[in-house]
């Protein structure tokens, strides 16, 4: 058993049918010695008397808020949560496996640049009685500070007979050095509590591996005289690291017809312009990627050919 926060305790339960459970001793936080009784949640049933209460925690029905009283007065509370292990594996019931980039991916994180700021998000199908707490650091043995805000509900989606809730959190490395080579990964830890169930989730990554630039901005077309060709131009996104001479991007320019089946013409360039043939009813899209490290491509920025 360990303390999650004041008066809230997590019991680690290795569960299987007929498991003996965990013996937990609760102590009433009071100088009083006599006339103390214990109850669970809203029930008036007396579970025991004395300054300590010994309970056998076998299942969620044994968790909840234990209260010690004397003469009708509440002396202290202890909220017991369960962290369940089955077949040697800690439960992961609260968050949904996003399965990308691989199975057992519960937390996904992205950064728009090398400033040390990043966003993580996760999915759940639980709509109520749910709290998250996020901590982060660079490295784990001698951790350097990363400050995370509060997790917030950022999207709700209905997919068939599933209703999904997306939560996200923003974090900022306290002393980020954008140009430095990373040797220690960022660690992100999320505590999730649903009712009386505690779970924790972790992710470890280098900022360079989670980079996803914003789409190029100010995408414009300039027709070339007496030609079906156009000059496409764009700019680096505002959120990308500076100077651009050091934090350089590469770009992919795509001409896509109205039909998805039509052949796509693609051009790759390090410049912020390109000359392409603009077909009728086609659109031109441009996306960006770090020039020197193959992290994610940005989303597309698009304009119609017409």
């Amino acid at each position: 058993i360990w303390e999650l926060k004041k008066d809230v305790y997590v019991v680690e339960l290795d569960w299987y049918p007929d498991a003996p459970g965990e013996m937990v001793v609760l102590t009433c936080d009071t100088p009083e010695e006599d006339g103390i009784t214990w109850t669970l949640d809203q029930s008036s049933e007396v579970l025991g008397s004395g300054k300590t209460l010994t309970i056998q925690v076998k299942e969620f029905g044994d968790a909840g808020q234990y209260t010690c009283h004397k003469g009708g007065e509440v002396l202290s509370h202890s909220l017991l949560l369960l962290h369940k292990k089955e077949d040697g594996i800690w439960s992961t019931d609260i968050l949904k496996d996003q399965k990308e980039p691989k199975n057992k991916t519960f937390l996904r994180c992205e950064a728009k640049n090398y400033s040390g700021r990043f966003t993580c998000w996760w999915l759940t199908t639980i709509s109520t009685d749910l709290t998250f707490s996020v901590k982060s650091s660079r490295g784990s043995s001698d951790p350097q500070g990363v400050t995370c805000g509060a997790a917030t509900l950022s999207a709700e989606r209905v997919r068939g007979d599933n209703k999904e809730y997306e939560y996200s959190v923003e974090c900022q490395e306290d002393s980020a050095c954008p140009a430095a080579e990373e040797s220690l990964p960022i660690e992100v830890m999320v505590d999730a509590v649903h009712k009386l169930k505690y779970e924790n989730y972790t992710s470890s990554f280098f900022i360079r591996d989670i980079i996803k630039p914003d789409p190029p901005k100010n995408l414009q077309l300039k027709p070339l005289k007496n030609s079906r060709q156009v000059e496409v131009s764009w700019e680096y996104p505002d959120t990308w690291s500076t100077p651009h001479s050091y934090f350089s991007l590469t770009f992919c320019v795509q001409v896509q017809g109205k039909s998805k089946r039509e052949k796509k013409d693609r051009v790759f360039t390090d410049k912020t312009s390109a000359t392409v043939i603009c077909r009728k009813n086609a659109s031109i899209s441009v996306r960006a990627q770090d020039r020197y490290y193959s992290s994610s491509w940005s989303e597309w920025a698009s304009v119609p050919c017409s």
């Epitope: 569960w15 049918p17 299942e59 969620f60 029905g61 089955e86 019931d93 199908t125 639980i126 209905v158 007979d161 599933n162 209703k163 649903h194 009712k195 009386l196 169930k197």
Partner: nanobody, 123 residues
Amino acid sequence: EVQLVESGGGVVQAGESLRLSCAASGYNFKDHDLGWFRQAPGMEREFVAAISWRGSSTYYADSVKGRFTISRDNAKNTVYLQMSSLKPEDTAVYYCAAGRLYPSSRSRDYDYWGQGTQVTVSS
């Protein structure tokens, strides 16, 4: 919101078998653990059995262990309670319940409840 509808109750002789079904609908049914409870006249609601949302783990009250089997078919959105070697003391209204705190034998740990189906075991 999960909706639960029980069926399969009836009158049987002691020693016979019966299979109860609980059809579920609504959002996120497959993410819920499912349980069966029962309530005899004048008695409190009593836990019978539960199955985890993955269907890989089951939990039984001592009074039904070895006689009752809980199972689920996520493709059919249905949970079953196979009851054998029935006894007169198994007579009760049987309720299907859905929640997210598996394992729990406590009724208030379940969020959604069916209307119940009557099982009567005569001697």
